[in-house]
Amino acid sequence: GDLLIQKTIKKQVVLEEGTIAFKNWVKTGTEVYRQFWIFDVQNPQEVMMNSSNIQVKQRGPYTYRVRFLAKENVTQDAEDNTVSFLQPNGAIFEPSLSVGTEADNFTVLNLAVAAASHIYQNQFVQMILNSLINKSKSSMFQVRTLRELLWGYRDPFLSLVPYPVTTTVGLFYPYNNTADGVYKVFNGKDNISKVAIIDTYKGKRNLSYWESHCDMINGTDAASFPPFVEKSQVLQFFSSDICRSIYAVFESDVNLKGIPVYRFVLPSKAFASPVENPDNYCFCTEKIISKNCTSYGVLDISKCKEGRPVYISLPHFLYASPDVSEPIDGLNPNEEEHRTYLDIEPITGFTLQFAKRLQVNLLVKPSEKIQVLKNLKRNYIVPILWLNETGTIGDEKANMFRSQVTGKIN
């Protein structure tokens, strides 16, 4: 019996036309939603004038349906048993699952001012930027609609820059009508224990963002893992959102719609400083902001974002060092709400439920030559928003899964 089941599973999780896995892999049968909470700054003037703590108030959720588009350019390579594809991006606003509309206004850090002052550290250039910031009536903070903040707006300051720069700014710009990849993953035909594991991303086995092992593209994309998952395993996966590979460890057994699943979570150790977790030394890319690599819980992904000072963390700086959150008032981290987990059906390796949570922050530093940043006395890693991307297997699919997979085993 068990061998027969194993044989069936091995056959059905291969990523090729005709298998259960392939059908769900090309276009996810699960509805995936991305909820955003925006950090609305309550005291912009006090921060700019007196370098006060930034008081934030989260507003949300604002919900979008995502990952509803089928993978594109799906190409099998029989020679090396891989399948390559593009994952198209799309987001549809869901008013009924949101607290407001895409036209809601927020006071947030001026993304262009913060980024430009960081990218152009030459003081003469900063003086040029200062005159353009003043001319465009820009400031350290700005009021933007949700739609602008997420998907892009024409920045008045950047529009005055006399040399070629992208004048459209947005945290996820460009998004709609773009695609992530090309991914090339093992299809499992020759070796089922490699199924869905990424061979190359954008044609490379490395990212070129980090030093040493930190730069490796490890594991799958977290949508599925090779079958017969053990609780003792450390599940590696790559997330293009955070420009790195990361891992999850077993936390507990969960019953999901009658299906026994393993809950794997991202441990705090994954976000620790090299002092605590020496493996993380290569994620520390500079010495000043990281306080000689002793700070933890924030990841500088500027190299992956054309030099823009983007820092990724968990929501509300969960698992981050006190010095990171100290200049920000209004944060309340808690594991239940703010950690990332994957609920994996161990026999197939399919992720049947997940909650991917992350926070997007931007570094802003004092600048002697930029008037609106001149009074700052310290660096701030400013939270802009946090997101919760979730997906749960539908009832119909769960019934099918129970009858065809877990039911047969029990």
């Epitope: 030459n122 003469f124 003086m127 820059v161 006399p162």
Partner: antibody, heavy 122, light 107 residues
Framework: EVQLQQSGPELVKPGASVKISCKTS????????MHWVKQSHGKSLEWIGG????????AYNQKFKNKATLTVDISSNTAFMEFRSLTSEDSAVYYC???????????????WGQGTLVTVSA | ETTVTQSPASLSMAIGEKVTIRCITS??????MNWYQQKPGEPPKLLIS???TLRPGVPSRFSSSGYGTDFVFTIENMLSEDVADYYC?????????FGAGTKLELK
């Protein structure tokens, strides 16, 4: 050793244009800002403008906005200043001066060319 | 535009004397003042940069102080080689502006 070598003296007629060059060596050209400074005979110094060779970003003293054009040629590590519609008021020594801005100390005009004398005369 | 008023226009001092030159700016420029020395037939030379920072290789008899709008440049014990023109430059905002200069001569 950082060196800025300017082109030789120029005698030009009123209404004409002149293009002065400043060839650099001893450093990474794109990492330093290049400025141009005017010094009329027996007078003080006037900042004309500056250019960031890395991206071509320029800033001019409004007084010279319609008079001077600053450019660079990265392949030859050379900065240029073109001065147009010359009058006797433009007779002066013109200096190129560069500075390096990374780190805490900000040395404006740390390195200078030897100067180019421009004489405007009919 | 920040105007820089430099005084005195000329100064005649004996060797060993203390030399003081002053620059006043029309706007608050923090400590973004620089000082240059120019000898005849030569380009100016940077002595002191922003934040009253003495440049490497410049003798310690040269110093400066000041913040906001009032700045002072000092030569503690004048030597004959210090005969030159001296200029201040504000680098807080564009356009960068120089003082009119001080001609330092030997008494």
């Amino acid at each position: 050793e950082v060196q800025l070598q300017q082109s030789g003296p120029e005698l030009v007629k009123p209404g004409a244009s002149v293009k002065i060059s400043c060839k650099t060596s001893g450093y990474t050209f794109t990492e330093y800002t290049m400025h141009w400074v005017k010094q009329s005979h027996g007078k003080s110094l006037e900042w004309i403008g500056g250019i960031n060779p890395y991206n071509g970003g320029t800033a001019y003293n409004q007084k010279f906005k319609n008079k001077a054009t600053l450019t660079v040629d990265i392949s030859s590590n050379t900065a240029f200043m073109e001065f147009r519609s010359l009058t006797s008021e433009d007779s002066a020594v013109y200096y190129c001066a560069s500075d390096y801005f990374y780190g805490d100390a900000n040395p404006w005009f740390a390195y200078w060319g030897q100067g180019t004398l421009v004489t405007v005369s009919a | 535009e920040t105007t820089v008023t430099q005084s005195p226009a000329s100064l005649s001092m004996a060797i060993g004397e203390k030399v003081t030159i002053r620059c006043i700016t029309s706007t608050d420029i923090d400590d973004d003042m620089n000082w240059y020395q120019q000898k005849p037939g030569e380009p100016p030379k940077l002595l002191i940069s922003e934040g009253n920072t003495l440049r490497p290789g410049v003798p310690s008899r040269f110093s400066s102080s000041g913040y906001g709008t009032d700045f002072v440049f000092t030569i503690e014990n004048m030597l004959s080689e210090d005969v030159a023109d001296y200029y201040c430059l504000q680098s807080d905002n564009l356009p960068l502006t120089f003082g009119a200069g001080t001609k330092l001569e030997l008494k």
